[in-house]
Amino acid sequence: LECYSCVQKADDGCSPHRMKTVKCGPGVDVCTEAVGAVETIHGQFSVAVRGCGSGIPGKNDRGLDLHGLLAFFQLQQCSEDRCNAKLNLTLRGLNPAGNESAYEPNGAECYSCVGLSREKCQGSMPPVVNCYNASGRVYKGCFDGNVTLTAANVTVSLPVRGCVQDETCTRDGVTGPGFTLSGSCCQGPRCNADLRNKTYFSPRIPPLVLLPPPTTAAPSTRAQNSSSTTSTAAPTTTTSIIKPTTAQASHTSPHEMDLEVIQEEGASLSGGAAGHGGTAGHGGAAGHQDRSNMEKYPGKGGAQIPAKGGS
């Protein structure tokens, strides 16, 4: 079996001219391509892998929401030679998300890493952004975490920082097959320089205080762990990402939604014009996005990231 091979961090690596072909080893009978895209209110980027895979042919598309950070995961596996170039891996990072000047800053200020390398997203090096409320959601917390994609025996990871809805989340994550977006939240200006070692204590949770043993016998009490609240299952939908309206504690599990996406199968690589209307994929890549549009998920076009200005 021969497959296309590339690794993309942000929008580099699977660029049009950098595509390779590889012969798969014995026993490998699928080509794989996987793309994970992350969108903050200040921009969007993707990580992607193409190569020889394992498992069975098929498709998997998911939309995930981690405290207002939106993630889209797509996996496509196929068993024909060089069949793994159907997903659109070439995302366009947002300049700002829509017309950002139209949004009123809400006072929160965070470091922002959108498609930046680990070297450029260290400590206080990345750019600082003003948070704002979008689509009726309040973004007053800051996030520091990572997106990781594993496919075709390759793992790619990029840092993610930006404004989120939660101010206290600790080591929260959302996952798809081979895909993880995880990190922690904080409150305060530029508080997300490094939350890798954040513990579960937060200003809203009183610390555990050791009291001297009582002099008189008293019934023992057990403190309820504030992070063990149960979460309400998110409804499955075929067209949109929906946040449950049920009230939640700050440490409820993030919600994962399986999305049924109609695929465009007519766009085969052999013959035909070379990449009309897009690059390294079929249809245009995701375009400039406004967060007010974010509830929309595309119904066709290779399960692309939702776009305001498609091709």
């Epitope: 942000a10 049009p16 001219h17 390779k20 072909t21 070379a274 990449g275 375009g287």
Partner: antibody, heavy 117, light 112 residues
Framework: EVQLLESGGGLVQPGGSLRLSCAAS????????MSWVRQAPGKGLEWVSY????????YYADSVKGRFTISRDNSKNTLYLQMNSLRAEDTAVYYC??????????WGQGTLVTVSS | ESVLTQPPSVSGAPGQRVTISCTGS?????????VHWYQQLPGTAPKLLIY???KRPSGVPDRFSGSKSGTSASLAISGLRSEDEADYYC???????????FGGGTKLTVLG
Amino acid sequence: EVQLLESGGGLVQPGGSLRLSCAASGFTFSNAWMSWVRQAPGKGLEWVSYISSSGSTIYYADSVKGRFTISRDNSKNTLYLQMNSLRAEDTAVYYCAREGLWAFDYWGQGTLVTVSS
Amino acid sequence: ESVLTQPPSVSGAPGQRVTISCTGSSSNIGAGYVVHWYQQLPGTAPKLLIYDNNKRPSGVPDRFSGSKSGTSASLAISGLRSEDEADYYCAAWDDRLNGPVFGGGTKLTVLG
């Protein structure tokens, strides 16, 4: 119909500057990687520079690094090449080209840059 | 000197088959990068002829075919016609130069 139209070429003295433009139409420009490729008179093709759809990833050929700057304005569907410290060996027809499936699938008609005293 | 090596010229009579070779190295074709071929008719801009080693854009006749093996690639043109007289360039990504590289070009002359 996809169209790429270069402009801005002309005669310039060594050490001078020029700014080339490439107006794109007929496709979603903001989704496409774009390149500049040049061809000296009677010679072969030489890739000059390469820019991602967002403008965040850029490559240059060694021969122009530090002197040329590629940029794009997606709101105007326009690709640019700012050329400084021009040399006689930069004399060429400059083409802008769109990246398709791992290849330059559309080319402009070219604009001639002549560097001479 | 070009990173990809092509013969400066080839020729053939109408109806014949000619091949143009393109030899690279371990940093480009040999690294697995796909190869593309461009046709440049006299006085015009280049046009994509073959992409991804052996695929034809719509509108390109099946008389044109591409192949790749190891560090080399080749373009074959069968049933030569006078309108095929042009310069032909191969191209591929090069890891060392971190950009696409072209062959020096091959001038095809259709005899007669």
